[in-house]
Amino acid sequence: MRRGPRSLRGRDAPAPTPCVPAECFDLLVRHCVACGLLRTPRPKPAGASSPAPRTALQPQE
């Protein structure tokens, strides 16, 4: 079940869909899932190179 916005906002500024830490919003199933189920950024050891933007995890996305 999708959670609605917490407050009334303009069409182009809807309220973020809340996901708890370690969850990410799955655009296809339209709810929060464990970030590990999606191909989301993984933390890298210091100095490791990566084809960014796989950097800091932002679960609210």
């Epitope: 500024a13 809807p14 973020p16 869909t17 296809l28 970030c35 189920l37 999606l38 191909r39 995890l57």
Partner: antibody, heavy 118, light 113 residues
Framework: EVQLVESGGGLVQPGGSLRLSCAAS????????WNWVRQAPGKGLEWVGN???????YYNPSLKSRFTISRDTSKNTFYLQMNSLRAEDTAVYYC????????????WGQGTLVTVSS | DIQMTQSPSSLSASVGDRVTITCRSS???????????LHWYQQKPGKAPKLLIY???NRFSGVPSRFSGSGSGTDFTLTISSLQPEDFATYYC??????????FGQGTKVEIK
């Protein structure tokens, strides 16, 4: 680094069937969504469909249920089964991985050409 | 389905020119989670597309600073500030906000004048 390699393209007669394969290395197809995107000669890109971490599939409604996406996790490979092929299905078919945070296609295969002709 | 309309369909430009490509969606691409999932890809003949810009204005890794993206809602722009020889290609906008299906613009071919 994730790499995708397609195979299975070729010449097929109208009404025929073909199965394309996309072998993934460097990442598990049990995570994320794995896609097929096609491009007719001289035309733009068209999303065909995908298969997700749970095995769920999503399709472009324009393809009228003629295409089916499946996977074999033991081979880390996913497939596009194409039935009742038509001349307008002639295209280069790309497989692509989807970034699950920003939702763009971040890794692509080299493409495989499917030609539907008698 | 969301329709993505690019303009122009093709353009001729010279090295050093500033090039602007526009993309308009049939409805707002702002998701209920607050993000705008509008991306730009570059494709050269016989090659797979490559990501240039994600989420309207973020350059992908390794993409030169001459590429920039802007816009909001339904109207978006890709700008190449000073066209280089390697930039002659076809550019596509794409949306992931209202999925499925994922949809692309029809493409803009940038040719040498």
């Amino acid at each position: 680094e994730v790499q995708l390699v397609e195979s299975g393209g070729g010449l097929v007669q109208p009404g025929g069937s073909l199965r394309l394969s996309c072998a993934a290395s460097g990442d598990s197809i049990t995570s994320g969504y794995w896609n097929w995107v096609r491009q007719a000669p001289g035309k733009g890109l068209e999303w065909v469909g995908n298969i997700g971490y749970s095995g769920s599939t999503y399709y472009n409604p324009s393809l009228k249920s003629r295409f089916t996406i499946s996977r074999d996790t033991s081979k880390n490979t996913f497939y596009l089964q194409m039935n009742s092929l038509r001349a307008e299905d002639t295209a280069v078919y790309y497989c692509a991985g989807l970034d699950g945070l920003y939702w763009y296609f971040d890794v692509w295969g080299q493409g495989t050409l499917v030609t539907v002709s008698s | 389905d969301i329709q993505m309309t690019q303009s122009p369909s093709s353009l001729s430009a010279s090295v050093g020119d500033r090039v602007t490509i526009t993309c308009r969606s049939s409805q707002s691409l702002v998701h209920s989670n607050g993000n705008t999932y509008l991306h730009w890809y570059q494709q050269k003949p016989g090659k797979a597309p490559k990501l240039l810009i994600y989420k309207v204005s973020n350059r992908f890794s390794g993409v030169p600073s001459r590429f920039s993206g802007s816009g909001s809602g339904t109207d978006f722009t890709l700008t190449i500030s000073s066209l280089q020889p390697e930039d002659f290609a076809t550019y596509y906008c794409s949306q992931s906000t209202h999925v499925p299906p994922f949809t692309f613009g029809q493409g803009t071919k940038v040719e040498i004048k």
